[in-house]
């Protein structure tokens, strides 16, 4: 019968010929009367056999990631008679793994959006690297993730690649962050190979800023001939938030004379001071009103940022018109 052990050949061997093992018949008494032959894919080109001894050699550098096993056939013939000594047999040569592939992030580019002011521990995104080496062969494909750039705002779970928030961020200070993640095989041990990826993390806006008047005092004039409904001027607040979080409503906080009103231009986010009652220079030519401004939409959980509305004072001077 045939005698052999399981055949393994390490990939990426640089020698011109590498002894893999021996294939022989137990009828072979070593007097060189038998001839061994190798057949199948790779026979003669990748693997050769010593016809006399049955020793098998790899004569080419192998790449496990290209092909991890070879199925060959062996024959043994009696040189004197030309007859087969043993029935033809199929055997396997397995290419054993070495750590010759670095981890690769295949889903690049990574981009994530997370609300500003999100609490610590909030999940941002999961990044996943793959390693072409053999996962069943030691630690060649066992990966550990680490953060190369992004502290102190982000952290990565070493075994899962899950990126989480580790410190609250304010969009109004910085609205996006580049995080660099490294994946290392060999669970970080010596000889490890690594790959990196960049993750663009954008902060979405939350309504954590109230509108604030640009000026603490506005000066307006109105002619005593102005009809009710006349727009006599505009006031403006600014809000560091964006979109609907910056939409605001202006209103009168104090006007003892009840002579003016303020409406909001929702396109420009300006407050328009409107004459509600006609004025008379001879009766009163100084009016003072206090206006306030608030955001249009404020979720309950963000009310803490909006406790006291910003106010401004508007001094209004009535201009005299010569009466006939």
């Amino acid at each position: 019968g045939w005698v052999w052990n399981q055949f393994f050949v390490p990939e990426e061997m640089n020698t011109t010929s590498h002894h893999i093992g021996q294939l022989r018949s137990d009828l072979d008494n070593g007097n060189n009367s038998f001839q061994y032959k190798l057949l199948g894919a790779g026979a003669g080109s990748t693997f050769i056999i010593d016809e006399r001894t049955g020793d098998i050699y790899a004569i080419q550098k192998l790449d496990r990631e290209e092909r991890s096993l070879y199925i060959l056939r062996a024959q043994v013939i009696d040189i004197a008679t030309g007859r087969a000594v043993e029935p033809e047999s199929e055997f396997v040569i397995k290419v054993s793994d070495i750590n010759d592939n670095e981890p690769k992030f295949l889903d690049e580019p990574y981009e994530a959006i997370v609300p500003e002011m999100s609490p610590e521990g909030t999940l941002v995104i999961q990044v996943t690297a793959s390693d072409a080496d053999d996962p069943s062969s030691g630690n060649n494909a066992r990966l550990l993730y680490s953060l190369l750039q992004g502290q102190p705002y982000f952290s990565v779970e070493p075994t899962t690649g899950v990126i989480r928030i580790s410190s609250k961020m304010d969009r109004e200070l910085q609205d996006e962050y580049w995080v660099i993640i490294q994946a290392k095989d060999m669970i970080g041990q010596p000889g490890a190979l690594s790959g990196t990826t960049s993750v663009l993390i954008k902060l979405s806006d939350v309504n954590d800023n109230k509108p604030i008047f640009k000026e603490s005092l506005y000066r307006l004039t109105v002619s005593e001939s102005a009809p009710t409904g006349t727009s006599i001027g505009t006031i403006m607040a600014y809000d560091n938030d964006i979109g609907e979080n910056a939409e605001m409503d202006y209103s009168i906080e104090e006007d003892d004379s009840q002579t003016f009103d303020i409406i909001t231009n929702h396109e420009t986010q300006e407050g328009i001071v409107i004459l509600k009652k006609k004025v008379d220079f001879e009766h009163q030519n100084h009016y003072g009103i206090r206006a306030k401004v608030k955001n249009h939409h404020v979720p309950e959980q963000l009310m803490k940022y909006h406790t006291e509305a910003s106010t401004t004072f508007i001094k209004i001077q009535v201009e005299d018109v010569d009466e006939p």
């Epitope: 005092l217 000066r219 003892d256 001879e282 009766h283 030519n285 100084h286 003072g288």
Partner: antibody
Framework: QVQLVESGGGVVQPGRSLRLSCAAS????????MHWVRQAPGKGLEWVAV????????YYADSVKGRFTISRDNSTNTLHLQMNSPRAEDTAVYYC????????????WGQGTLVTVSS | EIVLTQSPGTLSLSPGERATLSCRAS???????LAWYQQKPGQAPRLLIY???SRVTGIPDRFSGSGSGTDFTLTISRLEPEDFAVYYC????????FGQGTKVEIK
């Protein structure tokens, strides 16, 4: 602290001219409307003129309209009152006063400068 | 223009007494835009009360203002020696006008 110091007063003949000045310090002069108020000897206070913080608007009492001109120089923190064609009834102590920013009353006054119109 | 009439012209009182000064406007003073000033001989006026009843920071609480519309009052609850002076009311609702003043003198 807020300080207003008037100068330029003295004796002036009727029909001649005189320029009063008020040097302001201790506050942002360019943010405040400024006034001149006068007080004839032994009499009460009379408002004379006002100029807005930026010089854009000026208003005068009827008694001085067309004769007096109020002006300001925000670069030197100085208020002026140009008195043309003064009359005997313009004889008074002239005070400069600061208008409170968020209302119309006068929160600070200078010590005054006496103008005597006499031939 | 709004004419302010102060009464009495002179008030003769002793230290410790209560002083009540009146200021009447010829037409309603909008939004209680009325101030009171104190003036001592040779000095500039000093603001005491604004908005008819608001006391300026640093002014003793014996000074109080009240009133609205056309009738306003300055009250000095207990006269101190330094309170003897001339007091002016001023309206700033319609331009600026002053009353003719009330002199508070030592009796």
């Amino acid at each position: 602290q807020v300080q207003l110091v008037e100068s330029g007063g003295g004796v002036v003949q009727p029909g001649r001219s005189l320029r009063l000045s008020c040097a302001a310090s201790g506050f942002t002069f360019s943010s405040y409307d400024m006034h001149w108020v006068r007080q004839a000897p032994g009499k009460g206070l009379e408002w004379v003129a006002v100029i807005w913080y930026d010089g854009s608007n000026k208003y005068y009492a009827d008694s001085v309209k067309g004769r007096f001109t109020i002006s300001r120089d925000n670069s030197t923190n100085t208020l002026h009152l140009q008195m043309n064609s003064p009359r005997a009834e313009d004889t008074a102590v002239y005070y400069c006063a600061r208008e409170y920013r968020y209302s119309w009353y006068f929160d600070y006054w200078g010590q005054g400068t006496l103008v005597t119109v006499s031939s | 223009e709004i004419v302010l009439t102060q009464s009495p012209g002179t008030l003769s009182l002793s230290p410790g007494e209560r002083a009540t000064l009146s200021c009447r406007a010829s037409q309603s003073v909008g939004s209680s835009y009325l101030a009171w000033y104190q003036q001592k001989p040779g000095q500039a006026p000093r603001l005491l009360i604004y908005g008819a009843s608001s006391r300026v920071t640093g002014i003793p609480d014996r000074f109080s203002g009240s009133g609205s519309g056309t009738d306003f009052t300055l009250t000095i609850s207990r006269l101190e020696p330094e309170d003897f002076a001339v007091y002016y009311c001023q309206q700033y609702s319609n331009s600026w006008t002053f009353g003719q003043g009330t002199k508070v003198e030592i009796k």
